[in-house]
Interface confidence: medium
């Protein structure tokens, strides 16, 4: 399908002008290539009428132009002095007329209505309000005032000053007679319907001295605003319906093939399941306006959307609406990234979030979508650090790999972490994306001990077991803080051939803290990565206590994945208090995690990746 998009139907009246906007993907080639507006003939050929290279056909001379806006990816065709002969089928496009990078536009030019002299024309959108002004002479001031609608040759009474109201206008029309001295009465019609369209007659008095004034009421369906967004990106519909419906339920619906409108979301709590996890209805402003954000755009999201207000939270005739025609461009600048990421209970996920690469300095955010109250998204982490304290020790936002992608790592997964998450920046809002985290059956690949208690001044060694499939990955340990995870200096990782065979004894990367200080207390992550792309992580909490007994603190590699309550005893190894059954966050709370800067020099904290034989003793 062509990525060029414009209005499908354009209608106007003889003598008027039209402005037709066409959208295209703003690639470098597209921005500079020829733009054209051509008319389709009976033969199927499309004859150029105006182009961006300065060509204007004789038929359009002096009344048409084409302007390209390369920075927006749009071009506009303006045509003035329209005649009935301009009605027909056209194309706006890029490159060569026959190439297919185009969009079909139907233009209909109709004859203006024949109106009696002195007729006042009122042009109002459906659902809105019109005020018809009716002047009269002094002698008719005390006489009956009335408004009629002309239907064919007859006039039907709509309202008069003797309290008559036509049933078709019940509860939405009023006649106002001003105080003395003002020789004008007004008729106000609310919630206009398409059927209200037509010629009206104001009348004051009767007989030959009566005052009459013709009013032509044109009730229009709102012209849909064209919205051109990228696949996988985000769209925001801003809906301003006016103060008169500020306290009425609001909705966004999508027009279906039967020309009815299916509710996408409304303020009464209804939401289309197709938009689960990727829609928010923002609260309304004091002027009654509101907005709806949809992320993770799909091709099937294309179509005509209406927003409106009605107590039922759905489309009803005669209530104000706003319209959009959404086109989803498949030639997207937003890179593909997984929309579903799977993790196992106790394991981790690393989510890649795209952002506009031109905005590398923008703040990055990650939030958890909640379906309650028309959708909302509490921020969990931002590029400046953790936002929600309950994620302490298990969530981090990394700027890597950079150049249009950042990474969010969440570990210690539970079934409660399943759900939809949004990647956001404070820059280009079209780059908001959604990812769903699913928790599946399985075991974490990386195995670390539960919580470890280290003794001040002694040596602590923490093992991290990994499976053979990670043998080619880079392994690392880092110390978590609420502003990131500081990688700990790595010692020689041992002979590379240790990983080639990937035997039972070589799948280990160890962290050594020597000597243990108070600042070492906190969360540590063991992880694997390939270049700037992060894989799995496992977290362990290290508590630091005063020295009680002499001897070094050592976690047996062979028993690193011991059951939570298991007491690990080994030759020369002290008892490990494995507190994994407790929620480590309970005793991690309110604790200030010290900066790890002092670990950069020397080999106080070191990472060793080698076989367990080289660790000094086996528990086998």
């Amino acid at each position: 399908k062509s990525p060029v998009f414009g209005p499908q139907e354009v209608s106007s009246v003889e003598g008027n002008s039209v402005s037709i906007k066409c959208y295209y993907p703003p690639t470098s080639v597209n921005r500079h290539t020829r733009k054209y507006w051509c008319r389709k003939g009976a033969s199927g050929r499309c004859i150029t009428l105006v182009s961006s290279e300065g060509y204007v056909s004789s038929n359009y001379a002096g009344r048409a132009n084409l302007t390209n806006f390369p920075e927006n990816g749009t071009f506009v065709v303006n045509i003035a002095q329209l005649s009935r002969d301009d009605s027909g089928h056209y194309k706006c496009g890029l490159g060569i007329n026959s190439r297919g990078l185009s969009f079909d536009v139907s233009l209909e030019v109709s004859q203006g209505p024949e109106l009696p002299n002195g007729t006042e024309v009122y042009t109002v959108d459906v659902g809105r309000t019109v005020t018809i002004k009716c002047p009269f002479k002094t002698e008719n001031a005390p006489k009956t005032k009335a408004l009629y609608k002309k239907i064919g040759q007859t006039s039907v009474l709509v309202i008069d000053s003797r309290n008559y109201v036509n049933p078709n206008y019940k509860d939405r029309i009023r006649l106002r007679i001003p105080g003395t001295g003002q020789l004008i009465f007004t008729v106000v019609i609310d919630r206009l319907r398409l059927s209200d369209h037509g010629l009206y007659l104001c009348q004051a008095g009767d007989g030959s001295n009566r005052d009459e004034k013709n009013a032509d009421l044109q009730v229009l369906e709102p012209e849909p605003e064209l919205v051109y967004e990228d696949l996988r990106g985000s769209v925001t519909f801003h809906c301003a319906l006016g103060l008169e419906v500020a306290n009425v339920a609001k909705f966004l619906c999508r027009v279906n093939s039967r020309e009815t409108c299916d509710v996408v979301i409304n303020t009464l709590g209804k939401r289309d399941s197709a938009f689960e996890g990727r829609i928010l209805l923002n609260p309304q402003d004091k002027d009654g306006s509101f907005s709806v954000v949809i992320t993770g755009l799909r091709k099937e999201d294309e179509g005509r959307y209406l927003c409106g207000a009605h107590s039922d939270g759905q489309l009803q005739e005669g209530w104000p609406i706003q319209a959009w025609q959404l086109f989803v461009n498949e030639e997207s600048t937003i890179p593909r990234s997984p929309t579903v990421v799977k993790g196992v209970a106790g394991g981790s996920v690393a989510v890649l979030c795209p952002y506009n690469p031109k905005e590398s300095q923008s703040l990055k955010y990650w939030c958890l979508w909640e379906g309650a109250q028309n959708g909302r998204c509490p921020l969990l982490v931002e590029s400046q650090g953790l936002v929600q304290e309950q994620y302490e020790g298990r969530l981090s936002l990394l700027q890597e790999p950079g150049n249009g992608t950042f990474t969010v790592i969440l570990n210690q997964l539970t079934t409660q972490d399943a759900g939809f998450y949004w990647c956001l920046t404070n820059g280009d809002t079209r780059w908001r994306t959604t990812v769903e985290i699913k928790i599946i059956e399985g075991e974490p690949n990386l195995k670390v001990p539960g919580n470890v208690t280290a003794v001040l001044g002694e040596t602590l060694n923490i093992p991290c077991h990994f499976p053979c499939k990670f043998s080619s990955y880079e392994k690392y340990w880092c110390k978590w803080s609420n502003t990131g995870c500081q990688t700990l200096p790595s010692q020689d990782e041992g002979p590379s051939e240790a990983f080639v065979n990937c035997d039972e004894n070589s799948r280990l990367v160890s962290l050594t803290l020597n000597p243990v200080t108070r600042a070492d207390e906190g969360w540590y992550w063991c992880g694997v990565k390939q270049g700037h792309f992060y894989g799995e992580t496992a977290a362990v909490y290290v508590a630091v206590e005063e020295k009680k007994v002499a001897g070094s603190r050592y976690v047996s590699p062979a028993k690193a994945d011991a059951a939570p309550d298991e007491k690990v005893l080994d030759s020369g190894v002290r008892e490990i208090e494995n507190k994994a059954i407790q929620d480590p966050r309970l005793f991690a709370e309110e604790k200030v995690v010290a900066d790890t800067g002092d670990q950069a020099g020397g080999s106080r904290a070191s990472v060793d990746s080698s076989s367990s034989e080289e660790q000094g003793g086996s528990s086998k």
């Epitope: 923002n282 907005s291 955010y365 909302r376 998204c377 400046q384 650090g385 404070n426």
Partner: nanobody, 124 residues
Framework: QVQLVESGGGLVQAGGSLRLSCAAS????????MGWFRQAPGKEREFVAR????????DYADSVKGRFTISRDNAKTTVYLQTNSLKPEDTAVYYC?????????????????WGQGTQVTVSS
Amino acid sequence: QVQLVESGGGLVQAGGSLRLSCAASGRTINGYVMGWFRQAPGKEREFVARIDWSGSSTDYADSVKGRFTISRDNAKTTVYLQTNSLKPEDTAVYYCAGSAYYSGYVTHRDFGSWGQGTQVTVSS
């Protein structure tokens, strides 16, 4: 957490105006929904106004609609409440609050960061 400090309160005559400011420190408030609440003597704390992170969406209590305006300056990490046509019943301690919510409906419970408050007294 974000630290919030309110200023701009004072004594003013009915019909007068005050501009309350709320300065954030500790971290940016760029991603936060910000709100103003007030508490009159012997009454519960009540919602006054809120603004989303971009400043494009605002919401007001019925009692202040048309008189108060909330705005924000993310570069200065500051939120403002312009109070016009003040009435004696507006007398209260005004609190600034922050909520780590990216748009959507935010209830008063969701505001996790609070300032110490600034006193506004409107005399008749």
